[in-house]
């Protein structure tokens, strides 16, 4: 008898090379094989559970950056007046949540912020829990 | 044939709003659905393997905090003279281990330490390994 | 019907007690039960996917340390002029990758660097993906 295989784990790596002041970061998924999807610059959460979250990037100017998952809830990450980020966190997310950026710069210019090495990874930690597609 | 489902992963999120000097933190599990249990202010480990551990909180005064898992072993986390914590770690834990806090303040007062946003998450990383219930 | 079991997750914990200047660290796996293997002071990657990586250690002198996975690619970790490390990261690794150290000290002596508590943990986060043995 063939041993059971794991169904694919929900995970995604998105990249971002620019962020818009007072808005968010433009995220793209370099791989077609991701098990999670991007929609309207947000990562769509289909499965309830804990997620491992990794966030990296170097910014072309000092900014404040937050990563949100639900309106009216506090951010997953919040960094104030930084030129780079390299953080790891764990959070409980649920079906219908959407993970997205909010960015504010402190300059008078409203130009896009250039990002080098911008990467956001989400990995579901509770396969076997509730999912809806 | 229905594809195999994942059995639930061993994981838990506990909250703590106060810690007692020279003792530990009073932990509660907000969810009934957790796959791990709390007993005597300790999280009970039933399954051998690596665990992802996330610890967060803001304290009402400066303290030293350690997170232990076994008598005679070093702590999983040890923070000296801090007013907040936001840490992630990985550790190998085994059946019969118990994860618990030890807290010491540097004030002469022996009042409880109030905690804002106190959260401890454990997520098993080696399903398929040995478990005993 | 017996519920399906998880096949073992690819994971390993290696220890290192010394590093050689201009070379790497001598890694040993204390457990026979590891699901990943060490070869030529490198951890062999058999399965594509995200890996959770934990690196800890205290060094007998100031050094610069990098953890690589593939020739011509940037390091997983890069620490400059440190006497200790306690870092966690997430990275996408693939079959044929090899995880290994590079170490440089700033002393004129070419003696080995002694390491206390040197530990490197890798845990595969995408079971069900491609593996080759």
């Amino acid at each position: 008898q063939v041993p059971p295989q794991y169904p694919p784990i929900q995970s995604i790596r998105v990249q971002f090379t620019r962020c818009e002041n007072e808005k968010g970061c433009i995220i793209t998924s370099p791989s077609k094989d991701e098990t999670m999807k991007v929609q309207d610059n947000s990562i769509i959460i289909n499965c309830d559970g804990f997620y491992l979250i990794s966030l990296k990037g170097y910014f072309s100017e000092e900014l404040s950056l937050s990563l949100y998952y639900r309106k009216g809830r506090g951010p997953l990450f919040s960094l104030s007046k930084v030129t780079s980020v390299d953080s790891i966190g764990v959070a409980y997310l649920a079906f219908k949540d959407k993970v997205y950026f909010n960015v504010t710069t402190h300059s008078t210019s409203y130009k896009d912020i250039q990002v080098n090495g911008g990467e956001l990874i989400l990995i579901h930690q509770n396969p076997g829990g509730f999912c809806a597609y | 044939q229905v594809p195999p489902q994942y059995p639930p992963i061993q994981s838990i999120r506990v909250q703590f709003t106060r810690c007692e000097n020279e003792k530990g933190c009073i932990i509660t599990s907000p969810s009934k659905d957790e796959t791990m249990k709390v007993q005597d202010n300790s999280i009970i480990i039933n399954c051998d393997g690596f665990y992802l551990i996330s610890l967060k909180g803001y304290f009402s005064e400066e303290l030293s905090l350690s997170l232990y898992y076994r008598k005679g072993r070093g702590p999983l986390f040890s923070l000296s003279k801090v007013t907040s914590v936001d840490s992630i770690g990985v550790a190998y834990l085994a059946f019969k281990d118990k994860v618990y806090f030890n807290v010491t303040t540097h004030s002469t007062s022996y009042k409880d330490i109030q905690v804002n946003g106190g959260e401890l998450i454990l997520i098993h990383q080696n399903p398929g390994g040995f478990c005993a219930y | 019907q017996v519920p399906p079991q998880y096949p073992p997750i690819q994971s390993i914990r290696v220890q290192f007690t010394r590093c050689e200047n201009e070379k790497g660290c001598i890694i040993t796996s204390p457990s026979k039960d590891e699901t990943m293997k060490v070869q030529d002071n490198s951890i062999i990657i058999n399965c594509d996917g995200f890996y959770l990586i934990s690196l800890k250690g205290y060094f007998s002198e100031e050094l610069s340390l990098s953890l690589y996975y593939r020739k011509g690619r940037g390091p997983l970790f890069s620490l400059s002029k440190v006497t200790s490390v306690d870092s966690i990261g997430v990275a996408y690794l693939a079959f044929k990758d090899k995880v290994y150290f590079n170490v440089t000290t700033h002393s004129t002596s070419y003696k080995d660097i002694q390491v206390n508590g040197g530990e490197l943990i890798l845990i595969h986060q995408n079971p069900g993906g491609f593996c080759a043995y």
Epitope: T17, K56, Y58, F59, S60, E61, E62, T83, D86, S107, T108, S109, K111, D112, Q114, N116, G117 | - | S64, S66, G74, P75, S78, S80, K81
Partner: antibody
Framework: EVQLVESGGDLVKPGGSLRLSCVAS????????MSWVRQAPGKGLQWVAF????????TYADAVKGRFTISRDNAKNTLYLQMNSLRAEDTAVYYC???????????WGQGTLVTVSS | SYVLTQLPSVSVTLRQTARITCGGD??????VYWYQQNLGQAPVLIIY???NRPTGIPERFSGASSGNTATLTISGALAEDEADYYC?????????FGGGTHLTVL
């Protein structure tokens, strides 16, 4: 005092190879993002290659892609440019430049001359 | 790839205002950097992100950018300002310089 000192420039034949070095001092090199910029005799500046502080990202000008490799050794406070399959049009003074914010070239070296000629 | 266009040379009378332009497709949407290079010397950053001056750069240097043109303005040019000036932008982690403008102070 901040210093970037380039070396390794030489006369080399077309198709040959050369490795340039840039040694940094007076600042925390490992926290700075670094680039190579070149200037052909009597001409303007041309950006060549970039490496970020974590060595996780390298980018190249189209003119050198596949022939040049930028790297760094933070332990030695040194930036490198490995140049292969050199051409006459690669003749230039090569500057290393770096910034704490990745888009800035706050610090520059004085340059090293590379001449590609038969 | 992205192209930045500068006039090869600009002249200004001593203590008058010099304007050096840099043209590029919707350059106003990008952040522009300006460098000064004296003969035989390494370049020096004088303006970053369109309008900002690094510490130590005199107030007479200013920058602006909109539409398809970025401008470096030197208000009250001095003899020591005679040099080559280069504009620069970043585009998806690759960088482009303009061809450079030589400023002559008469």
């Amino acid at each position: 005092e901040v210093q970037l000192v380039e070396s390794g420039g030489d006369l080399v034949k077309p198709g040959g190879s050369l490795r340039l070095s840039c040694v940094a001092s007076g600042f925390t090199f490992s926290s700075y993002h670094m680039s190579w910029v070149r200037q052909a005799p009597g001409k303007g500046l041309q950006w060549v290659a970039f490496i970020n502080s974590a060595e996780s990202s390298t980018t190249y000008a189209d003119a050198v892609k596949g022939r040049f490799t930028i790297s760094r050794d933070n332990a030695k406070n040194t930036l490198y440019l490995q140049m292969n399959s050199l051409r006459a049009e690669d003749t230039a003074v090569y500057y290393c430049a770096g910034g704490y914010i990745w888009t800035h070239f706050d610090y520059w070296g004085q340059g090293t001359l590379v001449t590609v000629s038969s | 790839s992205y192209v930045l266009t500068q006039l090869p040379s600009v002249s200004v009378t001593l203590r008058q205002t010099a304007r050096i332009t840099c043209g590029g497709d919707i350059i106003g949407s990008k952040s522009v950097y300006w460098y000064q290079q004296n003969l035989g010397q390494a370049p020096v950053l004088i303006i970053y992100r369109d309008t900002n001056r690094p510490t130590g750069i005199p107030e007479r240097f200013s920058g602006a950018s909109s539409g398809n043109t970025a401008t470096l303005t030197i208000s009250g040019a001095l003899a020591e300002d005679e040099a080559d000036y280069y504009c620069q932008v970043w585009d998806s982690s690759t960088s482009v310089f303009g061809g450079g403008t030589h400023l002559t102070v008469l």
